[in-house]
């Protein structure tokens, strides 16, 4: 186990896991709304308001290289940004019948910890990634993916499950985080915002990206998800940020072009198999890694998160299609389906590359670098 083993908490109520409420613009809280007491930012989260720049203080960020066509996270300006002003507590909903995690939604009642107590745990996801504070771990080797290039047949299920669009993956997609850390891919899904509003789950220095892809994996040490939940390293998620670029992304178009068929909550369609690895960044060697949780109920902890440093580019039209096609519960648009960032509570994010060195305009400032925890791995 590369990351420190973090014991599953037995939280005593309280503790909110705020998600963004996908309300109409007119329902959004005003900027002066006070933060919710149940969800105080961790020390590593938001700074005092006097330190916050306005939007105009953020320099424009250009991709590092023309041929790569995608932004590198360490190229982002090192600025402290507030959480989105529209981040009230995100709650889950259960039908009268359901005393389980099978029925929940973004926004509404009751709070997620009442649906699943683990949602109030101390080591939750997503988190804000601060490259300057990440621990460089040379032991973190390039990710290995095998069998991700699927033939057109058999087809795969693409489903609108009411809180995301999910592609169910067949057996045989193998992924290794390193020697002896082997997984098989189960499904992938996306998180997004709304028109003019970004919707990634993880953030970088407070910067939220337009969207985020998650590929969920089960450790080969476990037979089933139910048995892996809450076990350190039982599940692993590969995450990548989606950004706006000048060209259409042909890999994503194979999925986005089918969204109209599954606009209704609970609907599904079959799509030809595709190259799943083409939905991810090309650079498997540069990434951030930490131990967190599922970002939706049951919020089980022990999940190994690997967040790519390189982003994936989609056209503006594609990002609009993603955020403006699907419908969720209660005749509401399926938008802003992301959870608010959660406090690190002492966790250290590791980087497979020296992310905190010469990577931003503020690199000259004295920074307390964390040490790598993967020694001897």
């Amino acid at each position: 186990q590369r990351l420190p083993r973090m014991q599953e908490d037995s939280p005593l109520g309280g503790g909110s896991s705020g998600e963004d409420d996908p309300l109409g613009e007119e329902d959004l809280p005003s900027e002066e709304d006070s933060p919710r007491e149940e969800d105080p930012p961790g020390e590593e989260d938001l700074p005092g308001e006097e330190d916050l720049p306005g939007e105009e203080d953020l320099p424009e960020v250009k991709p590092k290289s023309e041929e790569e066509g995608s932004l590198k996270l360490e190229d982002l300006p090192t600025v402290e940004a507030p959480g989105d002003p529209q981040e009230p507590q995100n709650n889950a909903h259960r039908d009268k019948e359901g005393d389980d995690q099978s029925h929940w939604r973004y926004g509404g009642d009751p709070p997620w910890p009442r649906v699943s107590p683990a949602c109030a745990g101390r080591f939750q996801s997503p988190v804000d990634i601060r490259p300057q504070l990440a621990a460089f771990c040379p032991a973190l080797r390039p990710l290995e993916l095998l069998g991700f290039q699927l033939p057109p047949l058999p087809e795969l299920r693409l489903r609108n499950n009411g809180h995301s669009v999910q592609l169910t993956l067949p057996p045989g997609l193998e992924m290794a985080l390193g020697p002896g850390r082997e997984y098989r891919a189960l499904q992938l899904h996306l998180h997004w915002g709304a028109a003019g509003r970004p919707g990634s789950e993880h953030t970088v220095e407070g910067h939220r990206f337009p969207a985020e892809i998650h590929v969920v994996h089960l450790s080969t040490a476990f037979a089933r998800v139910d048995e892996a939940l809450g076990r350190p390293g039982g599940l692993a998620v590969l995450a990548a940020f989606l950004e706006e670029g000048p060209e259409e992304n042909s890999a994503y178009e194979q999925l986005l072009s089918r969204l109209e068929e599954i606009a209704e909550e609970g609907s599904e369609t079959q799509v030809p198999g595709l190259d799943i690895s083409a939905l991810l960044p090309s650079d498997f060697s540069r990434y951030f890694q930490y131990e967190g949780s599922l970002t939706t109920p049951p919020c089980a902890q022990g999940v190994i998160w690997t967040v790519f440093n390189q982003t994936v580019m989609l056209s503006a039209k594609q990002l609009h299609t993603l955020s403006d096609t699907l419908w969720g519960p209660g005749d509401s648009r399926l938008q802003l389906n992301f959870r608010a960032t959660q406090p690190l509570n002492g966790r250290v994010i590791e980087a497979s590359f020296p992310a905190g060195v010469d990577s931003s305009p503020r690199a000259a400032e004295p920074v307390q670098l964390n040490s790598c925890l993967a020694a001897g791995d």
């Epitope: 019948e97 359901g98 389980d100 099978s102 058999p154 087809e155 795969l156 299920r157 489903r159 499950n161 999910q166 169910t168 993956l169 067949p170 057996p171 045989g172 098989r184 891919a185 189960l186 499904q187 969920v216 089960l218 037979a223 089933r224 998800v225 139910d226 048995e227 939940l229 599940l235 609970g266 599904e268 079959q270």
Partner: antibody, heavy 126, light 111 residues
């Protein structure tokens, strides 16, 4: 005790309909993937239909368009509506449950079914 | 569609013998394979899940192995009560029609 009990079988004419029920006790079936399996007299087991915990339903080619699997979580029951019945549908029909809670939102697949019901005989004959 | 090819279709062995039954999937199913024992007039009983894990209450003389497309059920020392028909079930997908299939069965008789 965790148990599944099928009912609803009987004699029906070709082209007729029948609805099988599978009542669960000792557990709530709402979070499980469930399956119908049949066995023609003297033959092997044949997968008929499956329903995941999101109530998405799938079928064997031999019954697609004629059979419908459904569940009623409030009644803790699984159903198989069989229409346009043929002589070759004559079999003992079993329901069975995925051995652990299903997380189909996470792409979970069943790797074994337990428990099974005792079976109910469907005879299609004129 | 997935197909499961099971062999042999029948076998006869003596008490104490080691018995091996194989199952081959038409495409990789990782370890989503289970083995069942069925006696006449009874419902199937789960023996092995996830290709190699012993179900609760099943004697340790039963074991399973394999991954991908080739799987084996072994009875290390055949007992009288093991006379039954054995089936494998492979699951490739539950999100497509015909994503699961049983093998044709192996009838085990005691000499």
């Amino acid at each position: 005790e965790v148990q599944l009990v099928e009912s609803g079988g009987g004699l029906v004419q070709p082209g007729g309909s029948l609805r099988l029920s599978c009542a669960a006790s000792g557990f709530s079936l709402s979070r499980y993937t469930l399956i119908w399996v049949r066995q023609a007299p003297g033959k092997g087991l044949e997968w008929v239909s499956i329903i995941d915990s999101s109530s998405s339903a799938y079928y064997a080619d031999s019954v697609k368009g004629r059979f419908t699997i459904s569940r009623d979580n409030a009644k803790n029951s699984l159903y198989l509506q069989m229409n346009s019945l043929r002589a070759e549908d004559t079999a003992v029909y079993y329901c069975a449950r995925d051995r652990v809670l299903s997380y189909d939102d996470y792409g979970d697949l069943p790797d074994g079914f337990d428990p099974w019901g005792q079976g109910t005989l469907v005879t299609v004959s004129s | 569609d997935i197909q499961m090819t099971q062999s042999p279709s029948s076998l006869s062995a003596s008490v104490g013998d080691r018995v091996t039954i194989t199952c081959q999937a038409s495409q990789s199913i990782s370890n989503y394979l289970s083995w069942y024992q069925q006696k006449p007039g009874k419902a199937p009983k789960l023996l092995i899940y996830a290709a190699s894990k012993l179900a609760s209450g099943v004697p340790s003389r039963f074991s399973g192995s394999g991954s991908g497309t080739d799987f084996t059920l072994t009875i290390s020392s055949l007992q009288c009560e093991d006379a039954a028909t054995y089936y494998c079930l492979g699951v490739y997908s539950i999100s497509t029609d015909d994503g699961a299939a049983f093998g044709g069965g192996t009838k085990v008789e005691i000499k």
